[in-house]
């Protein structure tokens, strides 16, 4: 339930934050889950715990596994799990999908690429940036704080961008790299009041109790690059992230461009292990842009399993 995936490369630094950390200053104990062995806090160890952070300096493939963190107080302990995977360095240039952080999109007016996870590290500017393994050079590229700015973005700027920086721990330096894809949105076009293609207004979606269910919110906003265009799901009028039910998550789909050239967005709502109480909720697919907001409401109903007679 309170688990987070983290990954890194061997011989690089990796720092992981306890998924259950709330306020700073609380005592946090770390354990290697498979053996229940306590992670030391002494910094002379290659892997050590430092409050809410677990540090691999540097990481080794054998460090892969699940780590338990317990945020302690006399009246309320809170437990989280960090699922850590350390990969061998690739000899070629390709960065495999499992090492990629979330994709970001840019346009001529907005082309910031943030370096993932950098806030966990003790680093100093400037960052080094690479595109498809080539060091970025030229006046169009500006490394600013923890992000890269590209001037006059063109479609050719799409690709995989890697940030590289040095983490300093007690005078010792460790390399860290992180990669994410960057896509470029077309500037030409127009925007319309959002049109929701799915779901239909007041649609009833049949689901089976105990099974998983997916709801797709799909809307089109015009042609070309869309500013402030978004699709999202709400539960009982509350954002999914604020509703706080881990079984119900939304996952951004691909930008779609239909044959008529319209720019559309998908948002998939995934409900794991559907429960009776999920049938009581109101699911709203919201599509919004500068023109306004359109809402389609979906409710779930129980799908009765078909009787099979011999």
């Amino acid at each position: 339930k309170f688990s987070k995936q983290s990954w890194g490369l061997e011989n690089e630094a990796l720092i992981v934050r306890c998924p259950r950390q709330g306020k700073p200053s609380y005592t946090v104990d770390w354990y290697y889950s498979q053996t229940n062995k306590s992670i030391p806090t002494q910094e002379r160890n290659r892997v050590f715990a430092s409050g809410q952070l677990l540090k691999f300096l540097p990481a080794a493939v054998a460090d892969s596994g699940i780590y338990t963190c317990i945020v302690r107080s006399p009246t309320f302990n809170r437990t989280g799990y960090a699922n850590v995977t350390i990969y061998k360095k690739q000899s070629d240039c390709n960065v495999p999908d499992y090492l990629m952080y979330s994709t970001v999109s840019g346009s001529e007016k907005n082309s910031k690429i943030y370096c993932p996870t950098i806030d966990l590290y003790n680093w100093t500017a400037p960052l080094e940036w690479f595109k498809n393994c080539q060091a970025l050079q030229g006046s169009r590229y500006r490394a600013h704080k923890s992000f890269l700015v590209i001037d006059n973005v063109m479609t050719e700027d799409a690709g995989d961008y890697t940030c590289k920086f040095i983490h300093n721990e007690n005078g010792a330096n460790y390399s860290v790299t992180a990669t994410r894809s960057f896509t470029v949105k077309d500037e030409q076009g127009f925007s319309l009041f959002p049109v929701i293609g799915a779901p239909a207004q007041n649609e009833i979606k049949e689901v089976e109790i105990g099974k998983n269910a997916n709801l797709t919110c799909s809307a089109c906003f015009g042609k070309g690059t869309q500013f402030l265009a978004a699709v999202l799901w709400q539960l009982n009028g509350t954002k999914i992230t604020d509703f706080g039910e881990p079984r119900i998550q939304q996952e951004e789909g691909q930008n779609q461009s239909f044959s008529n050239g319209l720019a559309c967005l998908d948002m998939v709502l995934r409900i794991a292990d559907v429960k009776e109480e999920d049938l009581l909720l109101q699911y709203d697919c919201l599509a919004l842009n500068l023109h306004g907001l359109r809402r389609h409401t979906v409710r779930l109903s129980r799908k009765n399993p078909i009787d099979h007679h011999s």
Partner: antibody, heavy 117, light 111 residues
Framework: QVQLQESGPGLVKPSQTLSLTCTVS?????????WDWIRQPPGKGLEWIGY???????YYNPSLKSRVTISVDTSKNQFSLKLSSVTAADTAVYYC??????????WGQGTLVTVSS | DIVLTQSPASLAVSPGQRATITCRAS??????????MHWYQQKPGQPPKLLIY???NLESGVPARFSGSGSGTDFTLTINPVEANDTANYYC?????????FGQGTKLEIK
């Protein structure tokens, strides 16, 4: 944004059971944290009644334990307080709140319950 | 139960001056390197608001004029400088064990 709102009768007769409900919006109460009831007699200080954790475990103030039940209605994202055999000394503003670790970081506005015949 | 005794019961301070409120616990609320004492502010007609947790940590969004200190059984909330809108009741609360208990409160008035 997490919001809590208390509801229930403002007047309860002596020896009866006080029943209050706290409706939580912006967060699922079964996901995490502990969900408290605290009361404050008019012009007096705060008294912790007890809480129920996201896991369903309950912890009560021993001074009230024999009379208190805190429960959760997950379908409505609500938690409730029942206090039996009330007397005039139970007249207070009753607050519901969220406890993260040790501290109550979100509170309802409170509801005044008067015990009187 | 751990009994928390606040002093003074009330005080009046001029704007720009320092206000100091103390809270004494009937037994130590410190263990494993942390002190499980917290401070709240309650303005008339409002619920309490968390100011300080673990004796000295400022809650997010609370002005740096508020600070906490202490360990073991003796704790202090300091407001420096005091402002006009600091008029309120202030409560300490411990979480060293169950039941959680509050101090009886200190009323701060601004002259």
């Amino acid at each position: 944004q997490v919001q809590l709102q208390e509801s229930g009768p403002g007047l309860v007769k002596p020896s009866q059971t006080l029943s209050l409900t706290c409706t939580v919006s912006g967060y699922s109460i079964t996901s995490d944290y502990a969900w408290d009831w605290i009361r404050q007699p008019p012009g007096k200080g705060l008294e912790w009644i007890g809480y129920i954790r996201y896991s369903g475990d309950t912890y009560y103030n021993p001074s009230l334990k024999s009379r208190v039940t805190i429960s959760v209605d997950t379908s409505k994202n609500q938690f409730s307080l029942k206090l039996s055999s009330v007397t005039a000394a139970d007249t207070a503003v009753y607050y519901c709140a969220r406890t993260m670790m040790d501290t109550m970081d979100y509170w309802g506005q409170g509801t005044l319950v008067t015990v009187s015949s | 139960d751990i009994v928390l005794t606040q002093s003074p019961a009330s005080l009046a301070v001029s704007p720009g001056q320092r206000a100091t409120i103390t809270c004494r616990a009937s037994k130590s609320v410190s263990t494993s390197g942390n002190s499980y004492m917290h401070w709240y502010q309650q303005k008339p007609g409002q619920p309490p608001k968390l100011l300080i947790y673990l004796a000295s940590n400022l809650e997010s969004g609370v002005p740096a004029r508020f600070s906490g200190s202490g360990s073991g059984t003796d704790f202090t909330l300091t407001i420096n400088p005091v402002e006009a809108n600091d008029t309120a009741n202030y409560y300490c609360q411990h979480s060293r064990e169950f039941p959680l208990t509050f101090g009886q409160g200190t009323k701060l008035e601004i002259k």
